[in-house]
């Protein structure tokens, strides 16, 4: 018996609260695919590598994504 159905997304719960960018190890945006029908935003925290799922529809999360991408574009040559 498989652990779950064929569809397998990573996120169990989603948060509307943005994380502190300083606590972030990495931020992944996983597009919808045959394995998971929805976009998933996964924040991996520096402490213990804890993974937090963020709500892609949340205004605060959209702002966080903008801030992180702005920060990245500043760093890249």
């Amino acid at each position: 018996v498989p652990l779950s159905r064929t569809v397998r997304c990573t996120c169990i719960s989603i948060s509307n609260q943005p994380v502190n960018p300083r606590s972030l190890e990495k931020l992944e945006i996983i597009p919808a695919s045959q394995f998971c029908p929805r976009v998933e935003i996964i924040a991996t925290m520096k402490k213990k590598g804890e993974k937090r799922c963020l709500n892609p529809e949340s205004k605060a999360i959209k702002n966080l994504l903008k801030a992180v991408s702005k920060e990245r574009s500043k760093r890249s040559p």
Partner: antibody, heavy 118, light 103 residues
């Protein structure tokens, strides 16, 4: 005040089925995974099953895999546990639990007793 | 987890939970009184939910997580469970529970 109100327990014969329900209130149900945890009489807590916030992923303990099915209806703020092919060892108080960040189960239902006996 | 622990009133109780590389995972602790649902007392190793008294504290290092209850009181006996999330199997693992008796 977060509330999880359970129903559906009772006495059932081995091999039969039973469905537990848990109605949630005072939080955005559609953003949270939900768990079922059980406790056999005089024993410790045992995790049973988990469903993701939108119902796309389900996870089960080995002891119930293939017999139990967890589902949810976000329009009714309700999570279900369909228990089939019940055995005497499934006799327990079943708790519905709201998922939380980093191993945090902050809200539990009142529990419902399931007795499997002939 | 040790199945039981007895302390005298006012003493400090240390309840231990052991597991391989436990320090790499977050541990939470639950108090259960007879006939009641479990109650979260510590999460993310050391954090206390609102409403939980400061005499409850937690730590996690090496292969051991500890729940410390200072100034124990002669209240109804409780059982304490540790719990962690196993990312590899996507399942929750509970300790066997420690019954605390304040004599």
């Amino acid at each position: 005040q977060v509330q999880l109100v359970q129903s559906g327990g009772g006495v059932v014969q081995p091999g039969r089925s039973l469905r537990l329900s848990c109605v949630a209130s005072a939080f955005t149900f559609s953003r949270y995974g939900m768990h079922w945890v059980r406790q056999a009489p005089g024993k410790g807590l045992e995790w049973v099953a988990l469903i993701s916030y939108d119902g796309s992923s389900e996870y089960y303990a080995d002891s119930v895999k293939g017999r139990f099915n967890i589902s949810r209806d976000n329009s009714k703020n309700t999570v279900y546990l369909q228990m089939n092919s019940l055995r005497a060892e499934d006799t327990a108080v079943y708790y519905c639990v709201k998922d939380g960040l980093a191993a945090k189960l902050g809200h539990w239902g009142q529990g419902t007793l399931v007795t499997v006996s002939s | 987890q040790a199945p039981s622990l007895s302390v005298s009133p006012g003493q400090t109780a240390n309840i231990i939970c052991s597991g391989d590389n436990l320090r790499t995972k977050y541990v939470s602790w639950y108090q259960q009184k007879p006939g009641q649902s479990p109650l979260l007392v510590i999460y993310q190793d050391t954090r206390r939910p609102s409403g939980i008294p400061a005499r409850f504290s937690g730590s996690n290092s090496g292969n051991t997580a500890t729940l410390t209850i200072s100034g124990t009181q002669t209240e109804r006996e409780s059982t304490y469970y540790c719990m962690t999330w196993d990312v590899d199997t996507t399942s929750m693992i509970f300790g066997g529970g420690t019954k605390l008796t304040v004599l």
